[in-house]
Amino acid sequence: GWVWNQFFVPEEMNTTSHHIGQLRSDLDNGNNSFQYKLLGAGAGSTFIIDERTGDIYAIQKLDREERSLYILRAQVIDIATGRAVEPESEFVIKVSDINDNEPKFLDEPYEAIVPEMSPEGTLVIQVTASDADDPSSGNNARLLYSLLQGQPYFSVEPTTGVIRISSKMDRELQDEYWVIIQAKDMIGQPGALSGTTSVLIKLSDVNDNKPIFKESLYRLTVSESAPTGTSIGTIMAYDNDIGENAEMDYSIEEDDSQTFDIITNHETQEGIVILKKKVDFEHQNHYGIRAKVKNHHVPEQLMKYHTEASTTFIKIQVEDVDEPGGGGS
């Protein structure tokens, strides 16, 4: 019968001829009366056999990631008779893995959006690298993820590539972050190969800013001839949030005279001071009112950022108008 052990050849061997093992018949008494032959894909070009001894050699550099096993056939012939000594047999040469492939991130570019002020531990995104080396061969394809850039705001789980928030972030201070993740094979041991990827993390807005008046004092004037409903001026607050989180409503906080009103121009986000009651210079030539501004909609969990509404003081001067003489006879 045939005698052999399992055949392995390491990939990427630089030698011109690498001994793999020996095929032999147990009838071979070593007197060179038998001839060994190799058949099948790779016979003669990738692998050769010593016809006398049955020793097999690899004569080409092999790449496991291209082809991981070769199925060949062996024959042994009695030189004197030309007959087969053993039935033709199939055998396998396995190409064993070396760590010659670095981890690669295949789903680039990575981009994620996460709400600002999210708590620590919030999941942002998972990045995944793949390694073409043999996962069943040692640690060649066992990956470990680490953060090269992004501390202290982000962390990455070493075995899963899951990126989480590790410190609260405020969109109004920085609205996007570039995080760089490294994947190392050999579970990070010496001789490991690595690959990196960049992740763009954008912060979406939450309503963590209240509107604040640009000025703490406004001076406006109104003619005593102005009819009710007249717009006598505008006031303006700033809100550094965006979209609906910056929509605001202006209102009167104090107006003892009940002479003025404020309406909100939702297009411009300005407050328009309106005359509610006619004024008379001779009766009262100036007024002081206080306006306040609030966001249109604030979720309950964000009320802590909106505890006291911003106010502004508005001084309104009444302009005298010459009135036609009202003298009696």
Partner: antibody, heavy 125, light 107 residues
Framework: QVQLVESGGGVVQPGGSLRLSCAAS????????IHWVRQAPGKGLEWVAV????????YYADSVKGRFTISRDNSKNTLYLQMNSLRAEDSAVYYC??????????????????WGQGTTVTVSS | SYELTQPPSVSVSPGQTASITCSGD??????VSWYQQKPGQSPILVIY???KWPSGIPERFSGSNSGNTATLTISGTQAMDEADYYC?????????FGGGTKLTVLS
């Protein structure tokens, strides 16, 4: 790393002039407003001036209005403070400080998150 | 012009809670920042927008702001917290600092 470095301080006579510089590195200078803040010996912090990220707006403390001019050169990553008609009460350590907040945000709600080491100005005859 | 008033000094025993106040007209309507300054050093931002922490500032520091008073609270005060503390607010396009409070950690 993120850094602001002031220079240009020195001793000057009352009525004289001085130009302070503040060199920025480690961040995108053109995205941030910058303040000048001063501190007289043994005293507290006093705000001097601010310039917006693009130079479009400048505001000054009443105590320096008309005498000091804040400016910036974004191509050189440098902020300036031109100080004219100097008085004894202008003697102080002058700091430049970065206004926290991205472009498009208004106001000074977010504080000054990066400060230089300061440069000393002494106005004395 | 707008003014912010702070007590000149506050003392606290190690491990105790220190509270530094800052008062100004309708201050609760504004946003307040707090700075720490140690002798010979530049100021450091420790709280912004009333109650938010800049990166790297321990959560022993906290802030609140209501009515006419903002408060910086330092819990579990340590010797390294001994410094001058300044509040800062914004009014009509200008920046205003409080006069500063010297925090002494008793030994």
């Amino acid at each position: 790393q993120v850094q602001l470095v002031e220079s240009g301080g020195g001793v000057v006579q009352p009525g004289g002039s001085l130009r302070l510089s503040c060199a920025a590195s480690g961040f995108t200078f053109s995205r941030y407003g910058i303040h000048w803040v001063r501190q007289a010996p043994g005293k507290g912090l006093e705000w001097v001036a601010v310039i917006w990220y693009d130079g479009s707006n400048k505001y000054y403390a009443d105590s320096v209005k008309g005498r000091f001019t804040i400016s910036r050169d974004n191509s050189k990553n440098t902020l300036y403070l031109q100080m004219n008609s100097l008085r004894a009460e202008d003697s102080a350590v002058y700091y430049c400080a970065r206004r926290a907040g991205i472009p498009g945000t208004t106001g000074y709600y977010y504080g000054m998150d990066v400060w230089g080491q300061g440069t000393t100005v002494t106005v004395s005859s | 012009s707008y003014e912010l008033t702070q007590p000149p000094s506050v003392s606290v025993s190690p491990g105790q809670t220190a509270s530094i106040t800052c008062s100004g007209d309708r201050l609760g309507e504004k946003y307040v920042s707090w700075y720490q300054q140690k002798p010979g050093q530049s100021p450091i931002l420790v709280i912004y927008q009333d109650n938010k922490w800049p990166s790297g500032i321990p959560e022993r520091f906290s802030g609140s702001n209501s009515g006419n008073t903002a408060t910086l609270t330092i819990s579990g005060t340590q010797a390294m917290d001994e410094a001058d503390y300044y509040c800062q607010a914004w009014d009509s396009s200008t920046v205003v600092f409080g006069g500063g409070t010297k925090l002494t950690v008793l030994s």
